[in-house]
Interface confidence: low
Amino acid sequence: DAHKSEVAHRFKDLGEENFKALVLIAFAQYLQQCPFEDHVKLVNEVTEFAKTCVADESAENCDKSLHTLFGDKLCTVATLRETYGEMADCCAKQEPERNECFLQHKDDNPNLPRLVRPEVDVMCTAFHDNEETFLKKYLYEIARRHPYFYAPELLFFAKRYKAAFTECCQAADKAACLLPKLDELRDEGKASSAKQRLKCASLQKFGERAFKAWAVARLSQRFPKAEFAEVSKLVTDLTKVHTECCHGDLLECADDRADLAKYICENQDSISSKLKECCEKPLLEKSHCIAEVENDEMPADLPSLAADFVESKDVCKNYAEAKDVFLGMFLYEYARRHPDYSVVLLLRLAKTYETTLEKCCAAADPHECYAKVFDEFKPLVEEPQNLIKQNCELFEQLGEYKFQNALLVRYTKKVPQVSTPTLVEVSRNLGKVGSKCCKHPEAKRMPCAEDYLSVVLNQLCVLHEKTPVSDRVTKCCTESLVNRRPCFSALEVDETYVPKEFNAETFTFHADICTLSEKERQIKKQTALVELVKHKPKATKEQLKAVMDDFAAFVEKCCKADDKETCFAEEGKKLVAASQAALGL
């Protein structure tokens, strides 16, 4: 339904509070370096304009598109060229090219200072002094650091953030109440950001069809009692929501997400028996709850898949008549029967089925050709099962830190050209799969592990895309979305890599390491480990373990010494010499 004024339509649908919050998120995700005060000024100007349009939809400029209105507003920023360089050239373009240009300049790794958490009393005072500014600042700081964060979900995080301060700032022990809540929000926020980044990469790099296939598989696992037509409708609506959010259309995205939650709750009887609690919650909580809802029970009487997809004489006829619908039905039927498979595995099976039909439906005897197609699935299923089994055993044997180190070595040998900070960050996150998924029973391990690994490897892909240094990473990231993990798993040591020259400075440590937190100290040691492997890619596990054990002992010894700096200088030289000897550097 067409509206005379799009901005008035969204303002009325969302309400002033959500409108302002979403415009702030949108602006902060586009202009990530702009000061908070500048963004607030822009948002207030847009909001005042929107109110004039609500009062009179025929008023001047009210008929303009949101991209035009927002883009014009962003292009008024005086320091655009000084702060953003060539991004300023976007302002010379017309819509829709201007918005595409802004999107292309979003930075997944902006050069922003690490957020230091203020003291609890300081935060509570700031919260009480000006609650609105305090919460806006939270939205701004998260949005500029995570330019693809799912905007309606960020509103939900902000609501929880506000609730935490409201409760804890009047508690007897403010810190004991608040800090665990903030830690939880931080960790959940990072995970939410990474999951959404994969959705946007899927849409932007592999297209709508790839995203829809992912959504069919996931929703069919979650709602196995729903009819195919119902799942298809949900997939279409969900694709629209995420396309809008990934495209910077945050007002439309939030509005459509609310409509989708309303539809799901009105039709829960034909979707899932698990939605009742979610649907009793307020809007933001409801949408979040639906997105995280557990899988419904599988219908008891599901027939064998083979009848419709292998044994039927009409397989090629049905495929030829509507390829994507038939493949969608295959994916739906397979996924609803297999909550124990990862979504990416289900997509690999569907791709294998599609390739087989493409080949066989053109053969002399199609049925004979595709009769054994399900046999081709066996190795595809066993590969992630075996990999998860092996890695969970290794995790249980080593614990998280040493498991991360094993992955650091593995991935540095595979792609040594990648920057050390990226290798450390990605390998640490890959290593978290152990504590996240290995505790689950067999039936839940694969969907937990492989779909989580897809999210983490996407982080590697988007960071690498900014500064490409490895053809192997580019190849694994771009060839197939669903085969990224198997592609990285299959990489062996890069024999073409010329080892980094040894630089003693890289392995020179100072007494400041003693004042770091345990996590930061681990990162320092893991950084050194990556550098060691880059110097000596052929070093054995045993050699590296010996050097790392010596290193840990060296840090412990010098941190206990009276004259720490001297200890680090003198013992450090000995350690470097011993390491060079041990590794043959």
């Epitope: 230091v116 003291e119 400041d512 004042t515």
Partner: nanobody, 117 residues
Framework: EVQLLESGGGLVQPGGSLRLSCAAS????????MSWVRQAPGKGPERVSA????????IYADSVKGRFTISRDNSKNTLYLQMNSLRPEDTAVYYC??????????PGQGTLVTVSS
């Protein structure tokens, strides 16, 4: 917002003493290691001393060892630097920083220490 306000500097004769203070706010002071850094005119910043979050670990540059003492009072969110046996070469702007950074962590201007007869 992080605030670090240094005080206690001034003009002192060689061999004299001064005690610098750094009042911290806007972050959980007790969870961070802290440093004193100085910058002499025309020179780069030099870390003078650092202290762990609980005060148990300390570090000193060779040039100040035995003369300067770093300490902290987490209940007051304050970092201290006791400077004895001052020398002309200790003349510099002194500022405190979070962690082991040698760049200012907050808007504080530092405090000027001048050692001259």
């Amino acid at each position: 917002e992080v605030q670090l306000l240094e005080s206690g500097g001034g003009l002192v004769q060689p061999g004299g003493s001064l005690r610098l203070s750094c009042a911290a706010s806007g972050f959980t002071f007790s969870q961070f290691g802290m440093s004193w850094v100085r910058q002499a005119p025309g020179k780069g910043p030099e870390r003078v001393s650092a202290i762990s979050s609980d005060g148990s670990g300390t570090i000193y540059a060779d040039s100040v060892k035995g003369r300067f003492t770093i300490s902290r009072d987490n209940s007051k969110n304050t970092l201290y630097l006791q400077m004895n046996s001052l020398r002309p070469e200790d003349t510099a702007v002194y500022y405190c920083t979070i962690g082991s950074s040698t760049t200012p962590s907050g808007p504080g201007q530092g405090t000027l220490v001048t050692v001259s007869s």
